[in-house]
Interface confidence: medium
């Protein structure tokens, strides 16, 4: 899967699927609150933390944002920092923890109806003030108000997995998130390691379905580390 090569402005701190630390690609990428270890579809954190350097919010975990560790610090040295809770100071949405957004410099609870308008303002494609070269498309990714009343089908824009129909999860796709199928037995899955590329996927896969976990495919044990294929397998 592709690293989240793209977005620097999109809202990232949204509640993860299944209540874990985003139990699918993008979750275990962060070094900031600790390493994330899979346990079924839940994740536990272990606090032998080392700061993870970053350039964009999307390179950090769901509960983090990318910034200089010290006020007025060298902008060239940025690390993933823990998100800010309700009523804490902020400068942008990504600084606030899941379920909150930045309003007038303070992290506040994201009432969905109000939040939708905020999304329309802030989930602009990362590169964007130039006019799109494409006809008939706004540069701004807007979310249909319908999505809060009907569950999104495969390919529908979403914010979180609860926006998607049964059997689907909300996963990143380029600069936005769409409903994608939860993985079935035998399908290729993404298992994050501490080493290597930490960025969130641009083409994110869902997590493995119930009763399945993401493990090295048996006939790939001998393969080199970089080419090991992980698939969803029965516990």
């Amino acid at each position: 899967t592709l690293n989240s090569v793209l977005n620097s402005n999109a809202i990232k701190n949204l509640p993860p699927p299944l209540g874990g630390a985003a139990g699918h690609p993008g979750s275990a990428v962060s070094a900031a609150p600790g390493i994330l270890y899979p346990g079924g579809n839940k994740y536990q954190t272990i606090d032998n933390y080392q700061p993870y350097p970053c350039a964009e919010d999307e390179e950090c975990g769901t509960d983090e944002y990318c910034a200089s560790p010290t006020r007025g610090g060298d902008a060239g040295v940025q690390i993933c920092l823990a998100c800010r809770k309700r009523r804490k100071r902020c400068m942008r949405h990504a600084m606030c923890c899941p379920g909150n957004y930045c309003k007038n410099g303070i992290c506040v609870s994201s009432d969905q109806n109000h939040f939708r308008g905020e999304i329309e303002e802030t989930i602009t494609e990362s590169f964007g003030n130039d006019h799109s070269t494409l006809d008939g498309y706004s540069r701004r990714t807007t979310l249909s108000s319908k999505m809060y009343h009907t569950k999104g089908q495969e390919g529908s824009v979403c914010l979180r997995s609860s926006d998607c129909a049964s059997g689907l999860c909300c996963a990143r796709h380029f600069w936005s998130k769409i409903c994608k199928p939860v993985l079935k037995e035998g399908q290729v899955c993404t298992k994050h390691r501490r080493k290597g590329s930490h960025g969130l996927e641009i083409f994110q896969r869902c997590y493995c379905g119930e009763g399945l976990s993401c493990r090295i495919q048996k006939d790939h044990h001998q393969a080199s580390n970089s080419s090991r294929l992980h698939t969803c397998q029965r516990h």
Epitope: T1, V5, L6, N7, E59, T133, W175
Partner: antibody
């Protein structure tokens, strides 16, 4: 007018290295993700690598992972592809291409003219 | 990885003909599909994006349709400048191209 101009191609021996450049003009370079796409002689198109507008994040096709490195210098409006441990199968015309925003399919809306890389002993 | 299969791999047609090229994905890709035209020695050119949207400056004789796994590029009335190779490309999961369809003069 949007323009992308590749350079740096040439003949190199297997195992050798080469660095391709793509000079961009006519648009705000730092706001666009960019990719390298290649085409072996008489064959189809193959995507190679992508980089975000800020350069903060990159990704590679499995066929080049660990050997190629994409980077960009936004102050120079230039995209790069460092190619190491080159193989005969890397022989191709290499195009740099810009990703359009605005549609979920994020197509390649502008392409350079390409630069030929030949890997041969 | 998602495989993209184009058919036919080549076809012969005359000016004024209606030409249809199909592209099939090995799994669901929604409408995350683009079409390109490439002439010998030249870079590809974007024709259709997101399955059915005509790129600015592309003649209206080109159209795209389909969603899910099956897609079609149609040239309603083939012109001399349309003889080229056409590629589909998906961006639902990674970025992969079809093998191409060469449109030749009959």
């Amino acid at each position: 007018e949007v323009q992308l101009l590749e350079s740096g191609g040439g003949l190199v021996q297997p195992g050798g290295s080469l660095r391709l450049s793509c000079a961009a003009s006519g648009f705000t370079f730092s706001k666009y993700a960019m990719s390298w796409v290649r085409q072996a002689p008489g064959k189809g198109l193959e995507w190679v690598s992508i980089i975000s507008g800020s350069g903060g994040t990159t990704y590679y096709a499995d066929s080049v992972k660990g050997r190629f490195t994409i980077s960009r210098d936004n102050s120079k409006n230039t995209l790069y592809l460092q190619m190491n441990s080159l193989r005969a199968e890397d022989t191709a015309v290499y195009y740099c291409a810009r990703h359009a925003h605005g549609a979920g399919s994020y197509p390649f809306d502008y392409w350079g003219q390409g630069t030929l890389v030949t890997v041969s002993s | 990885d998602i495989q993209m299969t184009q058919s036919p791999s080549s076809l012969s047609a005359s000016v004024g003909d209606r030409v249809t090229i199909t592209c099939r994905a090995s799994q669901y890709i929604g409408t995350y599909l683009n079409w390109y035209q490439q002439k010998p020695g030249k870079a590809p050119k974007l024709l259709i994006y997101a399955a059915s949207n005509l790129q600015r400056g592309v003649p209206s004789r080109f159209s795209g349709s389909g969603s899910g796994t099956d897609f079609t590029l149609t040239i309603s009335s083939l012109q001399p400048e349309d003889f080229a190779t056409y590629y589909c490309q998906q961006s639902y999961s990674d970025l992969t191209f079809g093998g191409g369809t060469k449109v030749e003069i009959k």
